[in-house]
């Protein structure tokens, strides 16, 4: 069918609550495109009827709510005037929430379920709630170790929980809860977050900052050698790992046999209040299979990607 396959995302979710995933893939979706969602390579698109439990809402796929049997690979097909991309999203549904039981709970937490607070500082936790405009979210309640959070050190501000004068006792398992309203029906959303405490002074917030790349595409000729730096600022003596990944795998592991794409040796420059880290990715020879694939730079919980793109034909040569 001429569509380029992109294997993008592994999401781990709790059953019995709403979930939405937006099919955005810069730079593909920045122009005039049509987006269609499918499940498990079905030829029949996901319904667009808003009364359906699973339906497409503009570029989103929306589950109201997610159920145990919804696990699987979903594809969103993005068709432009001259292009077609098929993005595969692997959704794994887990039945139980941690505060109900430890059985059948979320295994192997990904970075989005982990957040850091800085000891002695005023800091905050974020409740990640990503839904289309058709979903209205009510005020957020916060829980720690399965009990509702109360006390003057804690303030709820939109999707954030502000924590003043962070102490070691603030580590633990948090959850944020909101009521989502869609087409007159109400649903509960509950997101778990595991929180650790660091003593290091924050620089520019509580997470590493990726200066470059910035989720963009790079035009590069087929067969050329390419080196791309990932530049990260982070606190001094931080314990974050910085690396390049593709398809959720370290590039050195992914290209273990060919060694065609490698991660470089990390270097850093020390400033008074922070460090600037650089770790590069080297493409010894750019191949067709590299185009359109997000190469992700990871720094702790922060990520940014580059996508290689064939240069537009230069008609002046003809």
């Amino acid at each position: 069918d001429g569509c380029k396959d992109i294997f993008m995302k592994n999401e781990i979710l709790s059953a019995s609550q709403p979930f939405a995933f937006n099919c955005t893939f810069p730079p593909i979706t920045s122009g005039e495109v049509s987006v269609t969602w499918y499940k498990n390579s079905s030829k029949i698109p996901v319904s667009k009827i808003i009364q359906s439990r699973i339906h497409q809402d503009e570029t989103w796929i929306l589950f109201l709510p997610m159920e145990w049997g919804d696990s699987g690979v979903y594809q969103c097909v993005i068709k432009g005037r001259d292009s077609c991309h098929r993005i595969h999203v692997n959704l794994t549904v887990f039945e139980k929430h941690w505060c109900d039981t430890s059985i059948g709970g979320l295994p192997n937490l990904s970075d989005e379920y982990k957040q850091i607070l800085h000891l002695g500082k005023d800091d905050s936790l974020t409740c990640h709630l990503h839904f289309p405009k058709s979903c209205v979210l009510g005020p957020i309640k916060w829980y720690k170790d399965c009990n509702e959070i109360k006390g003057e050190r804690f303030t709820v501000l939109e999707t954030r929980l502000l924590v003043s004068n962070v102490s070691a006792e603030d580590r633990g398992n948090y959850a944020c809860q909101a009521i989502l309203t869609h087409s007159g029906k109400q649903y509960e959303v509950l997101n778990g977050i595991t929180v650790s405490i660091t003593e290091r002074a924050g620089y520019g917030g509580s997470v590493p900052k990726i200066i470059y790349p910035k989720n963009h595409s790079i035009e590069v000729q087929l067969g050329t050698t390419l080196i791309v730096d990932c530049n990260v600022t982070d606190t001094k003596d931080n314990t974050n790992l910085r690396c390049w990944r593709v398809n959720n795998t370290l590039v050195d592991d992914y290209y273990d046999e060919s060694k065609r794409i490698r991660e470089g040796v990390e270097t850093h420059v020390s400033f008074r209040e922070h460090n600037l880290y650089t770790v590069n990715i080297t493409f010894l020879e750019v191949k067709m299979e590299d185009y359109g694939l997000p190469f992700m730079c990871h720094a702790g919980v922060s990520t940014a990607y580059i996508i290689l793109q064939l240069p537009a034909p230069d008609f002046r040569a003809y």
Partner: antibody
């Protein structure tokens, strides 16, 4: 380091009750579920149930439902498992074990408490 | 409930030999939720392999786990004297949690 220290061996008569304790140290007691398991002499392991020390929520194996009660005292980081209406086939070693968020397995176990039910 | 059946019940081998322990589930278990524990007489069980194939802290690399769905295997590539013990598989997917009846690995 993480430690789960259980109370000593008990000898009980049929029909009586036994309360086994499990004192936790080296981690935040209220952040992890505590489970209990039974191992009869020369037999395999059998799950009894779990308690969340902060919310006190419990989930029991139906086989033990009605006879088991799990409680905790957060001030001393201790979990308890009480088994009532004891029978001779309750003679076993009872273990507590801890489960962490995002790690659904028993990474830490108590040393075990032998309960002997005999007339 | 999910019933886990381990085979063989007893395995008699000599040090240096390869051991293969099997665990079969009565219904499908996600690989994230299938674990193995080692137990020696008079001791508490000890986590050995978690999530089907990940070795717990300090477990030597001669131990490996594999499998999916209803069939799981614990393999010891070259038996050492300290490996002789009872091994239990366990599922953490649904309540009640269940263990296999154990495989006793004994010196031949």
């Amino acid at each position: 380091q993480v430690q789960l220290v259980q109370s000593g061996a008990e000898v009980k008569k049929p029909g009586a009750s036994v309360k086994v304790s499990c004192k936790a140290s080296g981690y935040t007691f209220t952040s992890s579920w505590m489970h209990w398991a039974k191992q009869a002499p020369g037999q395999g392991l059998e799950w009894i149930g779990e308690i969340h020390p902060n919310s006190a929520k419990t989930n029991y194996n139906q086989k033990f439902q009605g006879r088991v009660t799990m409680t905790r005292d957060t001030s001393i980081s201790t979990a308890y498992m009480e088994l009532s209406r004891l029978r001779s086939d309750d003679t076993a070693v009872y273990y507590c074990a801890r489960v962490d968020y995002g790690k659904p397995w028993f990474a830490y176990w108590g040393q075990g408490t032998l309960v002997t039910v005999s007339s | 409930q999910i019933v886990l059946t381990q085979s063989p019940g007893t395995l008699s081998l000599s040090p240096g030999e390869r051991a293969t322990l099997s665990c079969r589930a009565s219904s499908s278990v996600s690989s994230s939720y299938l674990h193995w524990y080692q137990q020696k007489p008079g001791q508490a069980p000890r986590l050995w392999i978690y999530s089907t194939s990940s070795r717990a802290t300090g477990i030597p690399d001669r131990f490996s786990g594999s499998g999916s769905g209803t069939d799981f295997t614990l393999t010891i590539s070259r038996l050492e004297p300290e490996d002789f013990a009872t091994y239990y598989c366990q599922q953490f997917q649904s309540s009640p949690l269940t263990f296999g009846q154990g495989t006793k690995l004994e010196i031949k």
